[in-house]
């Protein structure tokens, strides 16, 4: 990698300057695509900020950019005007250029901010040169708010600054009035005044009357050293404008402005809703606007004018629909700072806000809303509802267009069909079941953000309050006892004060759930079960016959039971008992109570018996450690010998 370019950037005070290929130009011996030449900002500027023309100009500092973005003029340095005057200031940016596999290259970009430079955005080289408005035939002070050369003084090191002043030499006097310093008129024999006199409020312009034509004076300003000596340093020659106002003139009154709303990359006319004034003295063509500061999200243009931005236009341009805003690719709102004048009154500041609408928004649904079964309610979060467009939309509003069927949405505890992203983020939006007959629900919302809408469906599921066994594999061909070590809704029973019951929805693929006869005297064998209760589990009345996969050699496999769990006053929930099975191994200790083992195994042990489950399991039922776990098949025989 190699870096060319001057690596210096000269910026006018308070302005925005793009980085260019003259300033910063990277290349690689491999001829890498400029998109892949990546700059990382190691240390950002101190006197301003670096930002991307098409991204948020108010948000986070820019961290990365590419050479391609530099070529496109999209990487901008903005100097932020300090409160204290200065003549020249220096800033640096430390960058790291990378493009694997090449080694990184460090670079420093020097930024010079100077009043010396010729600046189209700032015709004066002084800290302030704003001109003066004076009523016809009257006088007005020229203060430091209108004329200030403090920045020339700032070029002197601070210890010596008190011994210096700025000398203004009037090179062309006002034609319709006169300048006075401490009430003494200035004239060709005495054409000077000082910055210190200006600061003391001693400079006055007195209009001579006889019309409202423009006036002004030209001057040269330079540093003056101790005892009036001329010293080397910055100097400037410029003009100070004086506008004479009709004493009967009524100033224009700006009207309330509605922000312009526009989708990015489009064009929209500016109307009186955005810019209008009430001025009985002036025609619309006499009311002039000047752009003082433009946002980064687009520019103003005049129909019939050039394609580029305009900085001056009239109320007539607005009224006739000739003025338009052209949005660039930025998604960020911005504000034009304007000054408006009828030419006879001092300019008034005005602003025009431009809100960039997304062309589309999307509701992001990252997960369904899970409702804990015992609670029957849950707060929505950004996991369920979050609006994004070209950026996140924290101001999004939601309206229910189809409510949930088995519950309702509440905000602050009361049913609500509208809510905001902020209320979601603060956990105030809750879904609560009101009809406890379904384990799931859904609702549809319409999201609205910056004038654009989108709909989405939020799914709701109930999370069962059920402790499910998660141990090793179960033996194929055996019947194991289904009890609270495998399925336990005891906590749900305690929370609801009811006996939870289960409904078998699906499975197992290989096997079945059965009710175990209480004793051999009970008629019939095991009965197929589709519903059972927590009490059945606790009483040890249930068995799971673990089948063998048909049509293939015995091998480990997976199976599952899908159950619906019900309890009083809470919604039902669907839960799954997933388990692995393997061919029965008599030598292996199984961690569940076995009610019977495969027939073939019994034959081998010399004990022919039907493969129906045994009756009451005897000591094993109350044993905390299942009999089979005590000693494989012999343990099983011992425990079941007399059943």
């Amino acid at each position: 990698l190699s870096l060319e370019g001057s690596r210096t950037l000269t910026v006018c005070p308070g302005s925005v300057q793009p980085l260019s290929s003259q300033t910063l130009r990277a290349s690689s011996s491999a001829g890498t695509d400029p998109q892949l030449l990546l700059y990382r900002v190691v240390r950002g500027p101190q006197l301003g900020r670096l930002f991307h023309a098409q991204q948020d100009s108010t948000g986070e500092a820019l961290v990365n950019f590419t050479q391609a973005e530099v070529y496109a003029g999209n990487i901008l340095y903005e100097h932020e005007m300090p409160t204290e005057p200065f003549w020249e200031a220096h800033d640096t940016l430390e960058l790291q250029l990378s493009s694997p596999p090449a080694r990184d290259v460090a670079a420093t970009l020097a930024v010079a901010v100077s009043f010396e430079a010729a600046c189209p955005q700032r015709p004066s080289h002084l800290w302030k040169n704003k001109g003066l408005w004076v009523p016809e035939g009257q006088r007005a002070k020229i203060t430091m708010a209108a004329l200030d050369a403090s920045n020339l003084l700032a070029s002197v090191p601070s210890p010596q600054r008190l011994e210096h002043d700025v000398l203004f030499q009037v090179t062309q006097f006002p034609s319709r009035g006169q300048l006075l310093v401490s009430e003494e008129p200035l004239h060709a024999g005495q054409p000077h005044f000082l910055q210190s006199q200006l600061a003391a409020g001693q400079l006055v312009y007195a209009h001579g009357g006889g019309g409202t034509q423009q006036d002004g004076f030209h001057f040269r300003a330079h540093l003056q050293g101790p005892a009036g000596a001329t010293v080397a340093g910055p100097q400037t020659s410029e003009a100070f404008a004086i506008t004479v106002r009709d004493v009967n003139e009524r100033p224009p009154q700006p009207q309330a402005s509605v922000p312009l709303r526009i989708t990015r990359g489009s064009r929209a006319p500016i109307s009186r809703a955005q810019l209008s004034v009430v001025d009985p003295d002036s025609a619309p063509g006499e009311i002039e606007y000047e752009v003082q500061r433009a946002p980064h999200n687009g520019f103003l243009s005049l129909v019939g004018g050039g394609p580029g931005p305009v900085t001056h236009f009239t109320q007539a341009d607005v009224d006739s629909g000739r003025l338009a805003f052209v949005a660039n690719g930025s998604s960020v709102a911005g504000v034009f700072q304007l000054s408006m004048s009828d030419g006879a009154s001092p300019p008034l500041p005005m602003s025009l806000a431009v809100d960039i609408l997304p062309s589309a928004i999307e509701v992001q649904l990252q997960a369904p809303l899970e409702v804990p079964q015992a609670l029957g309610r849950s707060s929505l979060s950004q996991q369920q509802l979050r609006v994004v467009s070209d950026r996140e939309e924290p101001e999004a509003a939601y309206r229910l267009i189809q409510g949930p069927k088995y519950g309702h949405l509440l905000v602050g505890g009361r049913p609500a069909s509208a809510f905001s992203q902020l209320q979601i983020d603060q956990g105030e939006v809750v879904f609560a079941f009101t009809n406890f007959s379904s384990s799931h629900d859904h609702f549809r919302v319409l999201a609205l953000a910056r004038g654009v809408n989108a709909s989405a469906v939020v799914n709701i599921t109930v999370r069962a309050l059920l402790h499910v066994w998660a141990g090793g594999p179960w033996p194929q061909g055996a019947t194991l006892r289904l009890d609270p070590t495998i399925l336990d809704a005891g906590e749900l029973a305690n929370r609801t004060g009811s006996v939870p019951h289960f409904r078998l929805l699906e499975g197992p693929r290989h096997g079945r759930v059965v009710r175990v006869p209480r004793a051999r005297t009970e008629p019939g064998g095991s009965q197929l079960v589709e519903q059972f209760t927590q009490q059945d589990l606790e009483d040890g009345r249930l068995g799971l016959e673990v089948g063998r996969p048909e049509g293939r050699a015995p091998s480990p496999t997976g199976d599952s039971l899908t159950l619906e769990l019900w309890a009083q006053g809470v919604p039902p929930a669907v839960a799954s008992l997933d388990f692995a099975t393997e061919p029965y191994n008599a030598a292996r200790p199984y961690s569940v109570a076995l009610l019977s083992v495969p027939e073939a195994t019994r034959m081998e042990a010399g004990k022919p018996e039907s493969s129906t489950p045994t009756g009451e399991p005897g000591p094993m039922a109350s044993s905390p450690v299942p009999a089979v776990a005590k000693g494989g098949f012999l343990g099983f025989l011992e425990a079941n010998m007399f059943s």
Epitope: I401, H408, L409, L410, R414, A432, N435
Partner: antibody, heavy 112, light 107 residues
Framework: QVQLQESGPGLVKPSQTLSLTCTVS?????????WNWIRQHPGKGLEWIGY???????NYNPSLKSRVTISRDTSKNQFSLKLSSVTAADTAVYYC?????WGQGTLVTVSS | DIQMTQSPSSLSASVGDRVTITCRAS??????LNWYQQKPGKAPKLLIY???SLHSGVPSRFSGSGSGTDYTLTISSLQPEDFATYYC?????????FGQGTKVEIK
Amino acid sequence: QVQLQESGPGLVKPSQTLSLTCTVSGGSITSGYYWNWIRQHPGKGLEWIGYITFDGSNNYNPSLKSRVTISRDTSKNQFSLKLSSVTAADTAVYYCADFDYWGQGTLVTVSS
Amino acid sequence: DIQMTQSPSSLSASVGDRVTITCRASQGIRNYLNWYQQKPGKAPKLLIYYTSSLHSGVPSRFSGSGSGTDYTLTISSLQPEDFATYYCQQYSALPWTFGQGTKVEIK
């Protein structure tokens, strides 16, 4: 603030259908969540009859479900109650409400 | 259906008294409880929603509390205009149900 106003006949013959309408002002029936009908037998407590929601779905008290229909007319911002096969036991003051605010109630007497 | 039982059915009290009315649900109602005030010949008025949130315009002498199945309405200092019948109502599970009412009379 939302205001509700019931209207309909004050006298209904047994076995006929009681019909009442609630007119909502100061809010839209497509934005408030629940629009309920509640009744109160003379000198007795309150009994919820049913509701229609902002999206037009219904729920009714199981004790009255077979006889009740609640519908709405969004263009008029109204919702209505129909109770069929009435008997003297349906004599009551009928209220429409969104629970935050209630109509003033209308007495319906079932008598021949 | 969830049964709502209010106690007492009626009570006599004087202006300035602290009055407490309780409401018991036949099962937990997750704080989804409203309290209403009804005066003769008038419609009920919402006082408190979601157990303890004061409805707009309701004086702060009214307060609510409770959880699970047991809920309370308290009037900290009874005023002449507070003599009325009070009802609780649950909106935790359909059908919505009301308590039978508590009549607060002047002693």
